[in-house]
Amino acid sequence: MMTGTIETTGNISAEKGGSIILQCHLSSTTAQVTQVNWEQQDQLLAICNADLGWHISPSFKDRVAPGPGLGLTLQSLTVNDTGEYFCIYHTYPDGTYTGRIFLEVLESSVAEHGARFQIP
């Protein structure tokens, strides 16, 4: 039975040209994390593998940095970066846990961080 929960940074906003950290945290399970995938809609951004380390997709290499931790840093943000981001935790023996983050990239300097929320 899958008992874990993923906490994410939730709905967040950031300024165009700036950077943002996408963070997920898996808790309430004894399962072992073997890999975390970061995706934007259906596009793979990066993989953090427990054994092999980080792999950033070639098309995002210039603007995506690994970490902190299992998180992902997006740099040089554009309005086109607005949208849904997913962290997908592959865990043994539970299976996959998915967290969702919505990022809004704003033209002005009124960007504020949204509240944290939980996804079961």
């Epitope: 004894t30 073997t34 593998n49 054994d51 592959h90 023996p93 299976g95």
Partner: antibody, heavy 122, light 107 residues
Framework: EVQLVQSGSDLKKPGASVRVSCKAS????????MNWVRQAPGHGLEWMGW????????TYVQGFTGRFVFSLDTSVNTAYLQISSLKAEDTAVYFC???????????????WGQGTMVTVSS | DIQLTQSPTFLSASVGDRVTITCRAS??????LAWYQQNPGKAPKLLIY???TLQSGVPSRFSGSGSGTEFTLTISSLQPEDFVTYYC?????????FGQGTKVEIK
């Protein structure tokens, strides 16, 4: 070469305890979960449970709670199975096996120890 | 718990034969299934994972198929060393059970 090497066969009396070791080499020990599997003479494979090599947290299958303890010593890349209050029905070959594969759909026990025969007899 | 039922339990065949072993799950397990080969007195050896992916170093005469609840292991042309026991295992959550085994014997 990725391998798991287990301790040798053991003959024990009922009521005694036994510890089986499983030494890993050729890979990052804490990156892969470790499982324990029992095979009684003439019988099939029985999953006993597993241990999270990252946190040391063990999980036991029903029927393998109480007398069975999984543990780790990450400094020497070794997993242990301890069985206390041994009974004749504990006579079996015990295997350690690594969970290979990185994604949920590719998990499998890809590397196995050679097995340790534990015989319980008075 | 998800139960796996292998059939047949015993299979008699000859060198060169094509044989198929079936593994049925008591509920849907997607493609989270592995097949192992075990020689007497030895540790099991992984043949197939993710229902159909051949493990590195395993001869191509072995193949796996299926998804959901029904899976098969096929040996296209039996070799003398293939007359041993085969197990399926699901890895769809906890607990990860094995089938009861299929022993392939020489006819």
């Amino acid at each position: 070469e990725v391998q798991l090497v287990q301790s040798g066969s053991d003959l024990k009396k009922p009521g005694a305890s036994v510890r089986v070791s499983c030494k890993a080499s050729g890979y990052t020990f804490t990156s892969y979960p470790m499982n324990w599997v029992r095979q009684a003479p003439g019988h099939g494979l029985e999953w006993m449970g597993w241990i999270n090599t990252n946190t040391g947290n063990p999980t036991y299958v029903q029927g393998f709670t109480g007398r069975f303890v999984f543990s780790l010593d990450t400094s020497v890349n070794t997993a242990y199975l301890q069985i206390s209050s041994l009974k004749a029905e504990d006579t079996a070959v015990y295997f350690c096996a690594r969970t290979g594969g990185h994604t949920y759909d590719s998990y499998a026990f890809d590397v196995w120890g050679q097995g340790t025969m534990v015989t319980v007899s008075s | 718990d998800i139960q796996l039922t292998q059939s047949p339990t015993f299979l008699s065949a000859s060198v060169g034969d094509r044989v198929t072993i079936t593994c049925r799950a008591s509920q849907v397990i997607s493609s989270s299934l592995a097949w192992y080969q075990q020689n007497p007195g030895k540790a099991p050896k992984l043949l197939i994972y993710a229902a159909s992916t051949l493990q590195s170093g395993v001869p191509s005469r072995f193949s796996g198929s299926g998804s959901g609840t029904e899976f098969t292991l096929t040996i296209s042309s039996l070799q003398p060393e293939d007359f041993v026991t085969y197990y399926c295992q699901h890895l769809h959550g906890y607990p990860s059970n094995f089938g009861q085994g299929t022993k392939v014997e020489i006819k």
